[in-house]
């Protein structure tokens, strides 16, 4: 009998408010045994896959999707889904990335801390479930 897969979580480092030109990394987490993580955008047709999955804890695996230089087009809602053979999980909640005009250097401390859950996240619309290659530091730039 197939196991019920827990929903993945998504967070952003260093936070969800990123100055223009700075970097951001989306972190997708799921159970151990995940083969593929996919990062999707709300209302966009693009996505990124990675099979570079690391073990974050004895019970959890993760994958990281990095955007080196954030642009205005990167702002929006992101979510994760994973494949643990023989099936895909449900999608995570949406995480909203905000891009602001840079007021300081790329290490300016005014970015919000990353969060993997909480009221700022929009629940994933599961009517979008039909949608169902990066490495640690995967470039996710085409997810505009």
């Amino acid at each position: 009998q197939e196991e019920d897969l827990p929903r993945p979580s998504i967070s952003a480092e260093p936070g969800t408010v990123i100055p223009l030109g700075s970097h951001v990394t989306f972190v997708c987490r799921g159970p151990v045994g995940v083969q593929t993580f996919r990062l999707e955008r709300d209302s966009r047709s693009t996505y990124n896959d990675t099979e570079d999955v690391s073990q974050a804890s004895p019970s959890e695996s993760e994958a990281r999707f990095r955007i080196d230089s954030v642009r205005e087009g990167n702002a929006g809602l992101y979510r994760c889904i994973y494949y643990k053979p023989p099936k895909w999980s449900e999608q995570s909640d949406y995480l909203e990335l905000l891009v602001k005009e840079s007021s300081g250097g790329p290490d300016s401390p005014d970015t919000e801390p990353g969060s993997s859950a909480g009221p700022t996240q929009r629940p994933s619309d599961n009517s979008h479930n039909e949608h169902a290659p990066a490495s640690q530091g995967l470039k996710a730039e085409h997810l505009y």
Partner: antibody, heavy 115, light 110 residues
Framework: AVKESGGRLVTPGTPLTLTCTAS????????IQWVRQAPGKGLEYIGA?????YTYYASWAKGRVTISRTSTTVDLKMTSPTTEDTATYFC?????????????WGPGTLVTVSS | ELVLTQTPASVSAAVGGTVTIKCQAS??????FAWYQQKPGQSPKLLIY???NLASGVSSRFKGIRSGTEYTLTISDLECADAATYYC????????????FGGGTEVEIN
Amino acid sequence: AVKESGGRLVTPGTPLTLTCTASGFSLYKYNIQWVRQAPGKGLEYIGASTYAGYTYYASWAKGRVTISRTSTTVDLKMTSPTTEDTATYFCARHIDGDYSGYALWGPGTLVTVSS
Amino acid sequence: ELVLTQTPASVSAAVGGTVTIKCQASQSIGTWFAWYQQKPGQSPKLLIYGASNLASGVSSRFKGIRSGTEYTLTISDLECADAATYYCQCSDVGNTYGAAFGGGTEVEIN
């Protein structure tokens, strides 16, 4: 590659199953759509099997066809074909990184429904 | 239900000329949009995906533009090999927008 099979001459009302076989890639990552083209006509969307295992149909196709998938194939079952279903049937796979475009198409399989 | 209205149904142009094909969507479909070329007896070939991205191996003479719910395919410096039927498609299967093809545009090169 993807390749359709199962097309043949059938009489109206005879169920028919077409199979789209994937090779050279992992089917679990991709949406597969079924499209048909009647002789001398345009492309007509039938439905799709998504990577996550969901199935969707064009409004006209609901109840007339059933789409299912295995780890290497996606089937299109025509429950009770009529002469209007005579067409070449294509399956196609979307491109890496973008769900909107289907770059990998099979050669098509011809279904003829005639009494 | 989503409807894609493609115009014109047919067009004739000279070698070296330019052809413009339009596809009007009945609702906003964002980037869930592609253009295909099909020649007689062949399977469709992807030209443009994501409304404006050139598919791999496709000549840069093909250009896709989105303006609201109107999508345009422009073929410049026409060659004899461009004679074909062109189709637009929205492929947001099962989601907000749905999936459908336009009626097609037959391009003749004279």
